[in-house]
């Protein structure tokens, strides 16, 4: 029979191949039907009968047309530091991604095995490189003329405000404090106010990183804080 009108199972022509969504069964030496996603081969084909497919059992899946005897097991439930971005169904594996404020510290073939909390830069240090799906925050000391007074995984070092008269000089962890030069705003001569800059400056803040989109599976490994690095705090 010509291949295009043959019904499975059929013997392929010499040197020929089986059609789309069919496979060559070595035992039967026939082209046989594959099973659709969400199913598996319950009974393999013979020379006279085609593949018998059955639905995947609970918590298992097949994503492709196949002739596997058993569906693949879905990954473990997502751990508390992860978000389930794709549920386990008959046709797809569960996907767990790191929740906001976390990154993938230990990846695996299909995504994340272990999430870890993003490093927080302590006062006097700002974010040099923001965290990504797969990398931690890098902190750096605030350069002269800049400061950070927060413990944050997103804040960068910001410039000190510029004062006509400085009451308290700024340092790496504190903004400069200006002396008031406007008597109408002053409660007492030379009173210190927080703050009254001459020139405004834009707030240099980083947006919070989006959660990781690397697919993965929780392996229920213990998750502790990331090891402290210079200028970081392990919360």
């Amino acid at each position: 029979l010509p291949a295009q009108v043959a019904f499975t199972p059929y013997a392929p022509e010499p040197g020929g191949t089986c059609r789309l969504r069919e496979y060559y069964d070595q035992t039967a030496q026939m082209c046989c039907s594959k099973c659709p996603p969400g199913q598996h081969a319950k009974v393999f084909c013979t020379k006279t009968s085609d593949t018998v497919c059955d639905s995947c059992e609970d918590s298992t899946y097949t994503q492709l047309w196949n002739w596997v005897p058993e569906c693949l097991s879905c990954g473990s439930r997502c751990s508390s530091d992860q978000v389930e971005t794709q549920a386990c169904t008959r046709e797809q594996n569960r996907i767990c991604t790191c929740r906001p404020g976390w990154y993938c510290a230990l990846s695996k073939q299909e995504g994340c095995r272990l999430c870890a909390q993003l490093r927080k830069c302590r006062p006097g240090f700002g974010v040099a490189r923001p965290g990504t799906e797969t990398s931690d925050v890098v902190c750096k000391p605030c350069a002269p003329g800049t400061f950070s007074n927060t413990t944050s995984s997103t804040d960068i070092c910001r410039p000190h405000q510029i004062c006509h008269v400085v009451a308290i000089p700024g340092n790496a962890s504190m903004d400069a404090v200006c002396t008031s030069t406007s008597p109408t705003r002053s409660m007492a001569p030379g009173a210190v106010h927080l703050p009254q800059p001459v020139s405004t400056r834009s707030q240099h803040t980083q947006p919070t990183p989006a959660p990781s989109t690397a697919p993965g599976t929780s392996f229920l490994l213990p998750v502790g804080p990331s090891p402290p690095a210079e200028g970081s705090t392990g919360d």
């Epitope: 639905s55 609970d58 918590s59 439930r77 386990c88 008959r90």
Partner: antibody, heavy 120, light 108 residues
Framework: QVQLVQSGAEVKKPGASVKVSCKAS????????MHWVRQAPGQGLEWIGR????????KHDPKFQDRVTMTSDTSTNTVYMELSSLRSEDTAVYYC?????????????WGQGTLVTVSS | DIQMTQSPSSLSASVGDRVTITCTAS???????LHWYQQKPGKAPKLWIY???NLPSGVPSRFSGSGSGTDFTLTISSLQPEDFATYYC?????????FGQGTKVEIK
Amino acid sequence: QVQLVQSGAEVKKPGASVKVSCKASGFNNKDIYMHWVRQAPGQGLEWIGRIDPATGNTKHDPKFQDRVTMTSDTSTNTVYMELSSLRSEDTAVYYCARSPYGDFGAMDYWGQGTLVTVSS
Amino acid sequence: DIQMTQSPSSLSASVGDRVTITCTASSSVSSNYLHWYQQKPGKAPKLWIYSTSNLPSGVPSRFSGSGSGTDFTLTISSLQPEDFATYYCHQYHRSPWTFGQGTKVEIK
């Protein structure tokens, strides 16, 4: 919120049949299984079977092979378990419970139970 | 069928005690498919630990679960009055799915 509400207590004679219902609310019946588990007085839990309400596919302990029938009515989100040829040892509280597909069979919500008494 | 055997069948303990319940399967069970339920008299069972070691929301952190293969345990680090109940292990690895016979935790 998720609720499973079962039908009331039944008293049956040996040889009769009983049909227990379990109405689900607060969740989509898609991608879940509904199980039936029973507990004889003073005894442990015994799994009877389960149904996929969306497809009507069932699976049960071979022990109940010829006596149990599980059905579902998707229009009312209700599943039913019928046990025939009742005997005294079928006296038990019958529970329905759900397990979401992908949760490895963990039954996270249970009905309040239906006491079935088989007595002549 | 996979038989699930719990030990002890019952135990008496005091508030504050550390309690361990074991569940032994007659053949290997994947840890994802091993669950524990708590049941109090006249009430329906409640899912207490899922997939060997995970606590559903609302279950106190004094409960923990561990194990693999054929041996699994439920541990209560410091027994509280509300923990007195019967605990059942349950395997969903192979049909027919089976429960242990239960372990009743009573007040000493």
